[in-house]
């Protein structure tokens, strides 16, 4: 007889999830021979720790605390680039700018990106079918409080002036309920951060409006003052333009506005 | 069952060039790095260098660099390397390897043999 | 580069027979990080790509017979077949897996009478 099985409203763990997360992590501490002594069947054994055998609703940042020991990695703290949906930008950003890095530039953040995944409570099982999802189920689930964790810890790090790409295109420039705005945001420390820099990407070419003037960034720039931590924003007008001239900088046409 | 199947092998004449193609089963070349090593006649394994067919990033021996280009076409699942400017020097068996989710080189291609001869 | 040095370059053996080989590097492939020397030794038959033997210089791969035992520490590695089969026939490399450019050792050519 088949064992009932909580259907959740997302998307089922990632195929191939196992072999994904242990060929990503020996991949990673190839290019990055600062992390070849770390011992990727143990990060694996550890992340699977983390959510096998317990119930998805039920997920806790200390769940996550054997992965994060494992996976612990010093990255230059004034060289930290926060994104908020504008992923894909952000990571061409420091493919160029190598000495940039965000969250999925880490180990912990590549182990992950973009994949899903959830257990089943008591069975050593992966579900494959479905996974809860944040709004739908329930906030505590394995994907949701990995990046709640990484994401703090990331935040945590970072010192001097901290860069966030933030997205121009949306009705909410800054959105409070994103990672950066309900994570990162609150947890940089500012008897180490000076400034957080806000570069807002414009999506229109013809859009030539100063988006910093936008009032979800004005709420940024309070939230950011209140903390002791200076804010500056400049806009993005050609996101196309700014990753040239980032690979090309000493072309003529990069000295003007991007 | 992971696997890399190569293309076959290449009779060449000196100063030209050439591209050897790698072909990846069982899993997807975007999870790990692809790297070439060289082995000339009675002689030792050369490692050549390795591209990440994520971002095309590559990696080569300092010896290869004027030599060798690697590419990718994750689409394909392939990998590439072109030799140029051919001499009987380059005259071997290339291998493309991968270690996929082992520490270590686990799996080779069955290797191209390369002959460059006028 | 770290130069990878392999002694004998050949030897022959009788089978049943106990075989060692050497391999010295110029370098040391110890990582302080984690104690784990980054040296593999690899087993090529005539006409085949290398098989994986041993990596972090003592850990035999799974299916590796275990009259196959590697050894060692920092730039000297020793591999040893307790009891030569006749299959063993082969060409023996070791390869520096600690730096960049992975360097491999000339070899060792052993031979069955």
């Known amino acids: 007889v088949p064992r009932w099985r909580q259907q959740w409203s997302g998307p089922g763990t990632t195929k191939r999830f196992p072999e994904t997360v242990l060929a990503r992590c020996v991949k990673y501490t190839e290019i990055h021979p600062e992390m070849r002594h770390v011992d990727c069947q143990s990060v694996w054994d550890a992340f699977k720790g983390a959510f096998i055998s317990k119930h998805p609703c039920n997920i806790t940042e200390e769940d996550y605390q054997p992965l994060m020991k494992l996976g612990t990695q010093t990255v230059p703290c004034n060289k930290i680039l926060l994104w908020s949906r504008i992923k894909d930008l952000a990571h061409q950003f420091t493919q160029v700018q190598r000495d940039m890095f965000t969250l999925e530039d880490t180990l912990l953040g590549y182990l992950a990106d973009d994949l899903t995944w959830c257990g089943e409570f008591n069975t050593s099982k992966i579900n494959y079918q479905s996974c809860p999802d944040w709004r739908k189920d329930c906030s505590n689930n394995p994907v949701s409080v990995f990046w709640k964790t990484v994401s703090r810890r990331f935040a945590e790090a970072a010192c001097d002036v901290v860069h966030v790409m933030l997205n121009g295109s949306r009705s909410k420039i800054f959105d409070k309920n994103s990672t950066f705005g309900s994570v990162e945001v609150h947890n940089l420390q500012p008897e180490k951060v000076q400034t957080l820099e806000a570069w807002v990407i414009h999506g229109g070419r013809e859009d030539s409006r100063d988006l910093c003037q936008d009032p979800t960034i004005k709420e940024l720039e309070s939230i950011i003052s209140k903390r002791n931590i200076q804010f500056s924003c400049k806009n993005i007008y050609r996101p196309d333009k700014f990753l040239q001239c980032v690979k090309n900088p000493e072309d003529s046409s990069c000295t003007s506005e991007i | 069952e992971v696997q890399l199947q190569q293309s076959g092998a290449e009779l060449v004449r000196p100063g030209a060039s050439v591209k050897l193609s790698c072909t990846a089963s069982?899993?997807?070349?975007?999870?790990?790095?692809i790297h070439w090593v060289k082995q000339r006649p009675e002689q030792g394994l050369e490692w050549i260098g390795w591209?990440?067919?994520?971002?095309?990033?590559?990696k080569y021996a300092p010896k290869f660099q004027d030599k060798a280009t690697l590419t990718a076409d994750t689409s394909s699942n392939t990998a590439y390397l072109q030799l140029s400017t051919l001499t009987s020097e380059d005259t071997a068996i290339y291998y493309c390897?991968?270690?996929?989710?082992?520490?270590?080189?686990?799996?080779w291609g069955q290797g191209t043999t390369l002959t460059v001869s006028s | 580069d770290i130069v990878m040095t392999q002694s004998p370059s050949s030897l022959t053996v009788t089978a049943g027979e106990k075989v060692t080989m050497s391999c010295k590097s110029s370098?040391?492939?110890?990582?302080?990080?984690?104690?784990?020397?980054?040296l593999t030794w690899y087993q090529q038959k005539p006409g085949q790509p290398p098989k994986l033997l041993i990596y972090?210089?003592?850990t035999r791969e799974s299916g590796v017979p275990d009259r196959f035992t590697g050894s060692g520490s920092g730039t000297d590695f020793t591999l040893t077949i307790s009891s030569v089969q006749a299959e063993d026939l082969a060409v023996y490399y070791c390869?520096?897996?600690?730096?960049?450019?992975?360097?491999f050792g000339g070899g060792t050519k052993l031979e069955i009478k």
């Open positions: 390897v991968s270690r996929y989710i082992n520490y270590y080189f686990a799996y």
């Open positions: 069982g899993f997807n070349i975007k999870d790990s790095l």
């Open positions: 591209i990440d067919p994520e971002d095309d990033k590559t």
């Open positions: 370098q040391s492939l110890l990582h302080s990080g984690n104690q784990r020397n980054y």
């Open positions: 972090w210089a003592s």
């Open positions: 390869q520096n897996d600690y730096d960049y450019p992975y360097t």
